[in-house]
Each structure stands twice: as structure tokens, then as C-alpha cells.
């Protein structure tokens, strides 16, 4: 018989989690003994099992361990792991700290969506990233010409939405544009949103006649000539 | 005509509840996150909270997080307040303001429209 | 938090002259989109803040074109080529890019 004893002290020493809320956490604390010991957990000094939080946890017996997602301020608080068997009992303290973030308008991630060059009847995708605390929103939208005008009596241009999206933080959203006409030629917007406000970056899609054969293959030649 | 209509201001005591209203017309109010912006007496403004259009993502200054609580009800175009703990420092004219739509908006992205805001009083 | 810092506290303003008012953010509103995220409100007495200036230079409609906001990331300006009786009141500058959002400490202009 043994009392428990942790299998990866080296796994533990880092004591103090300071985390931007929203994040996920994890606190491990991977034993052993004989016999096989159990593990509980406690929230400043309380036994702890997650039921007055939102979310939830998880707790993974086999990992020695316990999970608490989108963190919150008041999910601050000394969190132990507390080991034992008949033989004897381990504990260990974790600090939390969940770091308050100021809300701020999507950020979108710079050169995306980027200005595309296709061929008639081929497919584009165009990326936009976006970086935002509160849960984001999209949309794609397509600058149209209205009367051989881009925009109205007020300024403002003419656009067709051609999605809107709900995504989870730091998701890449993709425009599929399936087999391109010269008609999809335009500029692009990815619009995003929040609680806070709207951001918006544009790209420009260039739509080429369809290729022709006698001319890609007389192309090369063409290059060493004066 | 979008309007924002406040209600629900009064005089109560430092320590009581106070629950304010604010009633949206003249456009899609399920599309705009709302916010709160108050104003004491003789002094500048103050933003107190914001609610995403669906009330998922709700966001409160330092001075009221823990004791106001923004929510809002689409189904009746209203947004609200509630107050507790109130302290005579919260004495101000409270404003209900259209925040930032779900899509594409021509002009500015929110904090064109303001109520003619309700007044709360916290005095013993 | 983002501090905005007015100047000056008070302006008064022969009509017909032009009036002009600072406010510093005490950290860049220039976002990623390449937008300028600074608004000027002009509250009258008894009235809520109306919108004047969006996005640090473009009118709200119906502003009248005396008004104009110009600056950069952190130093903002708000211009009024022609006072008129009708603009007296308090002008504040917004930052519109994070909460909490926050307003400078107001500008009242008065007529001479």
C-alpha cells in the first residue's frame, strides 16, 4: 500500500493562472498510490462540483483534472485538488485570475479578404478574419451599381448582402463564389459586428475571360521574343 | 419616426431598486445592441451599460457593474434597467441609446438615436 | 479606460465668428478598418446630446456644413466656421472604438 503522491510535480509549478475572461482553463494534478487514489476539488476552501456556474465544468477523473470554459470574473478564487486513499491524502492550490478585457469593436485580421484575380468559371474563396471579445456577426457584402451610379443621392454606396453569419470568436468566414461570370467582378466587403459596433474591410475581385488555348500555349514563346 | 421613450425615474432612498424602461419605435429594435448613458445633474455624460441585440453580450461601467443589471424584451420593443444598491451618486438623468445595428447601416454605426432620458433621484 | 480630455472648459463667441474645440484621447482611436472612431454630440439646454460628427470628420444629416471634425489617432478638433445663436450649448467628444465608452468633459459655447 502507499499514500498518493503526484506523478508530475513538474506539471504543477505553474500555481498562479492569470487568464483574459472568456478563456479556458485547466488545473491538473496527476497522482497515483495504492490504492488508486480519488480526486475533489474544492473553490476557496468549498467543495467545489460547478453547479452554480455557468457552463458548467468537467471533470476528468482519468486526466486528474478540471475544466472550466469561458471564465468569468467571478470564477476568481483558489481552486485545490484535493488526493486520497486509505492510506493518506495530497493536496495542491491553484490561484485563478481572470483578467477583465475592455469589449472593443471586431478587429479584422489585416490583407483579408485579399483582392482576387480569377478566370471565368472558376471558384474564389474570399477570407475574412475577425478578432472580437463580444460574440461576433458578419456579413458579405457586394458593391452593386444601380442607374450606371455605385452610390446614392446621400453618398452612401449600394451593396447587396450576400451572407450574414453568426461565428464564434477568431473563426476564419469564407465567401464561396462559385464558377465566377464577369459579372461577379466587384468589390467585396466583410462587414463585422458586436455590441460595441461594426468593422469593415473590402477586396477587389478581378474576373478574367476564360482562357484561350492557341494563346496560353503561343504565350511562352512570346516572352523571349523583342 | 424612430423614438426611444424612458420611464420608470423617481425618487427613492440610498439602498433601494429602481427599474427603468425604455419603449423603441420606428425601427427593427431586434437589430440594435442598446445602451444606457446617464447625465448628473450640472455634470458631463456617463456610459452605464450596453446589451447586444439578443441580449447574449451585455457589458456594464465599474461605478454599476454588480448592482444594475441591462436586459432587454424583443418581443415588446422595450429595453430596461434594473437598479439596485442605489447610492445618491447614481442621482442623474438616465438616456436610453440605439447602439450599433446587425448589418450594413448607412451613416454612423450606433449613438445617433437618444431618448429625452427619466430621471432618478437617490436621496434619503 | 480611455480618457478624453476637452479643451477649452467654455467659449464665448461673437455670431458669425468661428469657434473651435479640442479633446485628446488618451489612446488611439484609429481602428484597423482605418476608421476614426471619435463623435461630437452638441447638447442644448433641457435636450438630449444630438449627434453632429461621426467617425472623427462625417456629418450627420441634417448637420449644417459650419460643422466639421477633423485630427488624427489621439487629437481631435471641432470646427464651427460661423457661430450662430443656435449652436449655444455644451459639445462633447465621444470615443466610440471600446468599452466603456466614454465622453470628454464637455465644451459650453455661448454667444457674446
Known amino acids: 500500500q502507499q499514500a498518493p503522491y503526484w506523478t508530475h510535480p513538474q506539471r504543477m509549478e505553474k500555481k498562479l493562472h492569470a487568464v483574459p475572461a472568456g478563456n479556458t482553463v485547466k488545473f491538473r494534478c496527476p497522482a497515483a498510490g495504492n490504492p488508486t487514489p480519488t480526486i475533489r476539488w474544492l473553490k476557496d476552501g468549498q467543495a467545489f462540483h460547478g453547479e452554480n456556474r455557468i457552463g458548467g465544468i468537467r471533470l476528468r477523473h482519468q486526466h486528474w483534472s478540471l475544466v472550466m470554459e469561458s471564465v468569468v470574473p467571478s470564477d476568481r478564487g483558489t481552486y485545490t485538488c484535493l488526493v486520497e486513499n486509505a492510506v493518506g491524502s495530497i493536496r495542491y492550490n491553484y490561484l485563478l485570475d481572470v483578467l477583465e478585457r475592455s469589449p472593443h469593436r471586431p478587429i479584422l485580421q489585416a490583407g483579408l479578404p485579399a483582392n482576387t484575380t480569377a478566370v471565368v468559371g472558376s471558384d474564389v474563396e474570399l477570407l475574412c478574419k475577425v478578432y472580437s471579445d463580444a460574440q461576433p456577426h458578419i456579413q458579405w457584402l457586394k458593391h452593386i451599381v444601380i442607374n450606371g451610379s455605385s452610390f446614392g443621392a446621400d453618398g452612401f454606396p449600394y451593396v447587396q448582402v450576400l451572407k450574414t453569419a453568426d461565428i464564434n470568436s477568431s473563426e476564419v468566414e469564407v465567401l464561396y463564389l462559385r464558377n465566377v461570370s464577369a459579372e461577379d467582378a466587384g468589390e467585396y466587403t466583410c462587414l463585422a459586428g458586436n455590441s460595441i459596433g461594426l468593422s469593415y474591410q473590402s477586396a477587389w475581385l478581378t474576373v478574367l475571360p476564360e482562357e484561350d488555348p492557341t494563346w496560353t500555349a503561343a504565350a511562352p514563346e512570346a516572352r523571349y521574343t523583342d | 419616426e424612430v423614438q426611444l421613450l424612458e420611464s420608470g425615474g423617481g425618487v427613492v432612498q440610498p439602498g433601494r431598486s429602481l427599474r427603468l424602461s425604455c419603449a423603441a419605435s420606428g425601427f427593427t429594435f431586434s437589430s440594435y445592441a442598446m445602451h444606457w448613458v446617464r447625465q448628473a445633474p450640472g455634470k458631463g455624460l456617463e456610459w452605464v451599460a450596453v446589451i447586444s441585440y439578443d441580449g447574449s453580450n451585455k457589458y456594464y461601467a465599474d461605478s454599476v457593474k454588480g448592482r444594475f443589471t441591462i436586459s432587454r424584451d424583443n418581443s415588446k420593443n422595450t429595453l430596461s434597467l434594473q437598479m439596485n444598491s442605489l447610492r445618491v451618486e447614481d442621482t442623474a438623468i438616465y438616456y436610453c441609446?440605439?447602439?450599433?445595428?446587425?448589418?450594413?447601416?448607412?451613416?454612423?454605426?450606433?449613438?445617433?438615436?437618444w431618448g429625452q432620458g427619466t430621471m432618478v433621484t437617490v436621496s434619503s | 479606460d480611455i480618457v478624453m480630455t476637452q479643451t477649452p472648459l467654455s467659449l464665448s463667441v461673437t455670431p458669425g465668428q468661428p469657434a473651435s474645440i479640442s479633446c485628446r484621447s488618451s489612446?488611439?482611436?484609429?481602428?484597423?478598418?482605418?476608421?476614426?472612431?471619435v463623435y461630437w454630440y452638441l447638447q442644448k439646454p433641457g435636450q438630449p446630446p444630438q449627434l453632429l460628427i461621426y467617425e472623427l470628420s462625417n456629418r450627420f444629416s441634417g448637420v449644417p456644413d459650419r460643422f466639421s471634425g477633423s485630427g488624427s489617432g489621439t487629437d481631435f478638433t471641432l470646427k464651427i466656421s460661423r457661430v450662430e445663436a443656435e449652436d449655444v450649448g455644451v459639445y462633447y467628444c465621444m470615443q466610440y472604438i471600446e468599452a466603456p465608452l466614454t465622453f470628454g468633459g464637455g465644451t459650453k459655447v455661448e454667444i457674446k
Open positions: 441609446v440605439r447602439g450599433a445595428g446587425r448589418g450594413y447601416t448607412y451613416g454612423p454605426d450606433g449613438f445617433d438615436i
Open positions: 489612446r488611439s482611436l484609429l481602428h484597423s478598418d482605418g476608421k476614426t472612431y
